[in-house]
């Protein structure tokens, strides 16, 4: 492993669609993938007046926007579906919404909002 | 690196069965998710359904219900899938598929085919 | 379930050429959409997964792009061995679904 950086070896596996179709939908996935690519775990989800509902959880492959991020944090501002990646074993466990606000001139003191955590 | 490699063409005639099977060669294959496709000839493909064999339980279409069955060996690495009730519309090649990962991202290996022809 | 369309169903195109192939599905499939490249007698080959990422080994020539429900498979500077059949599959929701198929053939 290079010092620093999380291998992620296993994610919180979990799939709504499996549901309907009476399959296991939920454990933990062991991620594989080549040696020399990196492994994510993700977790995609929809709020549903302002109810969570997970879509899918698992294994990401070496995606360049998921290096390097302990935490499962979607940042894009109001996604029709949620989607977060992170590295380190389940770190799909706990995911958030934190959006990036538009950079403006604040008219008052700036608060940085906290992110809502889901799991 | 997982290589697929399948059973060999079948004759079959219509209301019978067929069973195809698939061995996995490499490591962790209990915790693979396989899928089968079928492709009739100079037709598209069409998704039959997948299982992880550690989970035993098989995912299928809804247009092969009842007709498909898709289990898995874990001692031998091999992945069967078997159609009953064939009728000529069946005649396709089978092919069997590694998914890159549980949630299927893509469907990475695939095994030869093989030809299932369904004729009277 | 989810209806994929592609467009064009056959184009033809020269060596060194760039061509887009569009994937439409019916209904939102966020970037579970993978592209795959068939030539005749051969088993389909997986070039582009979770709508944007290059499968290890497949050339960078081949870029897909979207999410949701529009898709593209991009080939620039066409090489001969090219010249296949392309499928989108969406594997977002079961059934998953392929594509009917572009054909790309030399002009």
């Known amino acids: 492993a290079i010092l620093g950086r999380s291998e992620t070896q296993e994610c919180l596996f979990f799939n709504a669609n499996w549901e309907k179709d009476r399959t296991n939908q939920t454990g933990v996935e062991p991620c594989y993938g080549d040696k020399d690519k990196r492994r994510h775990c993700f977790a995609t989800w929809k709020n549903i007046s302002g109810s969570i509902e997970i879509v899918k959880q698992g294994c990401w492959l070496d995606d360049i926007n998921c290096y390097d991020r302990t935490d499962c944090v979607e940042k894009k501002d109001s996604p029709e579906v949620y989607f977060c990646c992170c590295e380190g074993n389940m770190c799909n466990e706990k995911f958030s919404y934190f959006p990036e606000m538009e950079v403006t001139q604040p008219t008052s003191n700036p608060v940085t909002p906290k992110p809502p955590y889901y799991n | 690196q997982v290589q697929l490699v399948q059973s060999g063409a079948e004759v079959k005639k219509p209301g019978s069965s067929v069973k195809v099977s698939c061995k996995a060669s490499g490591r962790h294959f209990g915790s693979l998710q396989i899928s089968w496709v079928r492709q009739a000839p100079g037709q598209g493909l069409e998704w039959m359904g997948g299982?992880?064999?550690?989970?035993?339980?098989?995912n299928y279409a809804q247009k092969f219900q009842g007709r498909v069955t898709i289990t898995a060996d874990e001692s031998t690495s091999t992945a069967y899938m078997e159609l009953s009730s064939l009728r000529s519309e069946d005649t396709a090649v089978y092919y069997c598929v590694k998914d890159l990962t549980w949630t299927n991202l893509g469907l990475d290996i695939w095994g030869q085919g093989t030809m299932v022809t369904v004729s009277s | 379930e989810i209806v994929m369309t592609q467009s064009p169903s056959s184009l033809s195109a020269s060596v060194g050429d760039t061509v887009t192939i569009t994937c439409r599905a019916s209904?939102?499939?966020?970037?579970?959409l993978a592209w795959y490249q068939q030539k005749p007698g051969k088993a389909p080959r997986l070039l582009i997964y979770?709508?944007?990422q290059l499968l290890s080994g497949v050339p960078s020539r081949f870029s897909g792009s979207g999410s949701g429900t529009h898709f593209t498979l991009t080939i620039s500077s066409l090489q001969p061995e090219d010249f296949a059949t392309y499928f989108c599959?969406?594997?977002?929701?079961?059934?998953?679904?392929f594509g009917p198929g572009t054909k790309l053939e030399i002009k």
């Open positions: 599959q969406q594997s977002y929701s079961t059934p998953f679904t």
């Open positions: 299982i992880i064999p550690i989970y035993g339980t098989a």
């Open positions: 979770a709508a944007e």
């Open positions: 209904q939102g499939v966020s970037r579970w």
